[in-house]
């Protein structure tokens, strides 16, 4: 679809005569008839196949024709066509004299013709005007012409319809050849597909408007390149969605079981050495001078009561020193210079001579001990605490500090390892002498029944088109991660590309 435009510029008829040579009375009131038709080697009368147009009276005898296009007038003359411009044409321009106001062909005498010109040739679509001048014996006509496309038509023949748009069926303007030129941020044959945020993962991300990156299920992050780990995964990571690969020192289905209590919590004090001994279990090996489960208690060397025979102990930086009572000597006041005559036995102890009176021995009443019955009985000397418990004197009584796994006054009771319900997924717990054992239900295995074995939603290969299947362990369902070009919960649908333009 386009328009053949003809701009009449000047008509010269100096003598004011008709084609017959007869003069016009009072002058030649001139109007034009234009016939546009298909190319003819010799232009002949017949239908104006491309269109016709007539002007009103434009002047008398000789005159210049005003350009009237801006005011909506009739110059240039418009000859619209609704077909592909063929590139060739024939043009007939007739100048007529109008004796009266009726310009219809049937109202004019046949000899009212002033002049007739006929041209033919090639003409390409374009904005440039072709200037021409045709002269006869009595007249001269200067004019220019061109062919332009109608609005929204493009191409060499004005055959391509293109309407710029910016809605969800396309975001584009039209190029001179009628092809689409996508607006920034859009792509695709019809410019309806947004260009996602730069770096947005091709398979795991998509967008509904430019510079956006929306993540498919199982993926997260600005570029949708980070997998979402299994729901509840505590100290673990993933390389594909719904995984939970435990960080070092952690175990269990959700990586929430601490296998390295020593590193994560540093429970041992005062430079003690920590050893992991199971889940949330550890043992501290104390440096000399320290005691307690966590080596938190400073151990005085006098606590072991090394001084005998009533000697008093004094702590020193490099050990201890015994101050012996009269009649005793030695590192621990273990040597006596006394005999029974010196009444050396305290607290009602009875003295017995030895070695012909050179030495003695005290027989102590209950609750007292020592070579001179000078000490109350240390209730811990008999090691009353079982299972490695530590005995602590507390005045007239004593108490046992038990190792993990034991309880009772003397640490004689084995704490049930099953009390913490360590068996996952409904496993049955059995106490053993040195730990516990889990009997797992169908579908689970491992020391704590934490490993899912038989139920695998991906086992049936539900995903199509080489998609990757992930089992969601919390729901026994699967998630398909589609390769580029496929969508759907099983990646069963190809993302169709629109076919080419229909023309």
């Amino acid at each position: 679809s386009g328009v053949f435009q003809l701009q009449l510029q000047e008509f010269i008829n100096e003598r004011g005569v008709l084609a017959s040579g007869r003069p016009c009375e009072p002058g030649c009131r001139t109007f034009f008839r234009v016939c546009l038709k298909h190319f003819q080697a010799v232009v002949s009368p017949g239908p104006c196949t491309f269109g016709t147009v007539s002007t009103p009276v434009l002047g008398t005898n000789s005159f210049a024709v005003r350009d009237d296009s801006s005011g909506g007038g009739r110059n240039p003359l418009q000859l619209p066509f609704n077909f592909t411009w063929p590139g060739t044409f024939s043009l007939i321009i007739e100048a007529w004299h109008a004796p009266g106001d009726d310009l219809r062909p049937e109202a004019l005498p046949p000899d009212a013709l002033i002049s007739k010109i006929a041209i033919q040739g090639s003409l390409a679509v374009g904005q440039n005007w072709l200037l021409d001048e045709q002269t006869s014996t009595l007249t001269r006509l200067r004019y220019s012409y061109r062919v332009i496309c109608s609005d929204n038509y493009y191409g060499d023949n004005c055959s391509r319809l293109c309407k710029k748009r910016n809605d969800h069926f396309g975001h584009y303007v039209c190029q001179p050849d009628g092809n689409l030129s996508c607006l920034p941020g859009w792509t695709g044959e019809y410019c309806q597909q947004p260009i996602c945020l730069s770096g947005c993962h091709e398979q795991n991300g998509y967008c509904s408007k430019p510079a956006e990156c929306l993540c498919r299920p199982g993926w997260q992050g600005r570029l949708c390149n980070e997998c979402i780990p299994h729901n509840g995964c505590r100290h673990g990571t993933c390389s594909t969605p719904w995984q939970c690969t435990c960080d070092e020192g952690w175990g269990g289905l959700f990586c929430d079981q601490d296998l390295n209590y020593c590193t994560h919590h540093s429970p041992c004090k005062n430079g003690a050495t920590c050893s992991n001994s199971g889940q949330r279990s550890y043992t501290c090996t104390c440096r000399p001078g320290y005691t307690g489960v966590d080596c938190e208690l400073e151990l005085s060397e006098c606590d072991s009561n090394p001084c005998r025979n009533g000697g008093s102990c004094k702590d020193q930086e490099d050990g201890y020193h015994c101050l012996c009572p009269p009649g005793y000597y030695g590192l621990h006041c273990e040597h006596s210079t006394l005999s029974c005559a010196d009444s050396p036995c305290f607290n009602g102890g009875s003295c017995r001579e030895r070695n012909q009176g050179a030495n003695y021995a005290c027989e102590c009443p209950p609750n007292f001990t020592g070579s001179n019955c000078e000490k109350k009985v240390d209730r811990c000397t008999s090691n009353p605490c079982a299972n490695g418990g530590q005995c602590l004197n507390r005045g007239p009584s004593r108490m046992c500090r038990c190792r993990p796994g034991f309880t009772g006054t003397y640490c004689e009771l084995h704490v049930s390892d099953c009390a913490r319900n360590p068996c996952a997924h409904g496993g049955t717990c059995h106490d053993l002498e040195n730990g516990l054992m889990c009997t797992c239900p169908a579908g689970f295995s491992g020391r704590r029944c934490e490993v899912r074995t038989s139920i695998d939603a991906c086992a049936s290969s539900p995903c199509f088109n080489r998609a990757t299947c992930y089992t969601d362990l919390s729901t026994d369902t699967f998630v398909c991660n589609c390769p580029y070009g496929f969508v759907g919960s099983r990646c069963e649908f190809p993302v169709g590309l629109p076919p080419s333009f229909p023309w």
């Epitope: 309407k163 969800h168 069926f169 509904s208 649908f493 169709g496 629109p498």
Partner: antibody, heavy 121, light 106 residues
Amino acid sequence: EVQLQESGPGLVKPSETLSLTCTVSGGSISSSSYYWGWIRQPPGKGLEWIGDIYYTGSTYYNPSLKSRVTISVDTSKNQFSLKLSSVTAADTAVYYCAREDVILRGGSDYWGQGTLVTVSS
Amino acid sequence: SYELTQPPSVSVSPGQTASITCSGERLGDKYVSWYQQKPGQSPVLVIYEDFKRPSGIPERFSGSNSGDTATLTISGTQPMDEADYYCQAWDRDTGVFGYGTKVTVL
């Protein structure tokens, strides 16, 4: 041959939410060449475009209904749905679902047979 | 909001030409589709992209669009062409239908 089929209740009480589903067969709802639209026609009146959706979930609504309309898509079921809240008697109409073709510059080449929804107490 | 105006009714004798107009501001800059709807039936696309016919639509249906007016022409109208006809265009992201024209074949 692509076919569209509307389904949902034929009677809805005023102030409640109208819910309809369109099931697409014979073609994938996930094609990049199509939008999936809802159009309605009150008895004896003309067609009114309600809104449409792309398989990615992008939605476009008629401004006059936007505050009450929600259109969603379920690619796994090859379905898309319409919800219209706070309905009144003026929402009584035959509701059509249709396929809008990008290549046809938005022309709707396939339509459902329509379902009459009456709003009445 | 954008409006498309159609004459409520057009009457035509069998074999004659029926022309239905659809007017809207700068409508020639938009792509126009035309739908035929017979009583109790769903609409059928008869013209898209101003003048193109989907497969299966008879050649007697033609379309044009320029300026502010699009026209659907039914040449050699047949009794089976009696129906309501709707024009449709897109204004930004909104679909807009004309009010509809009832074509009666006398």
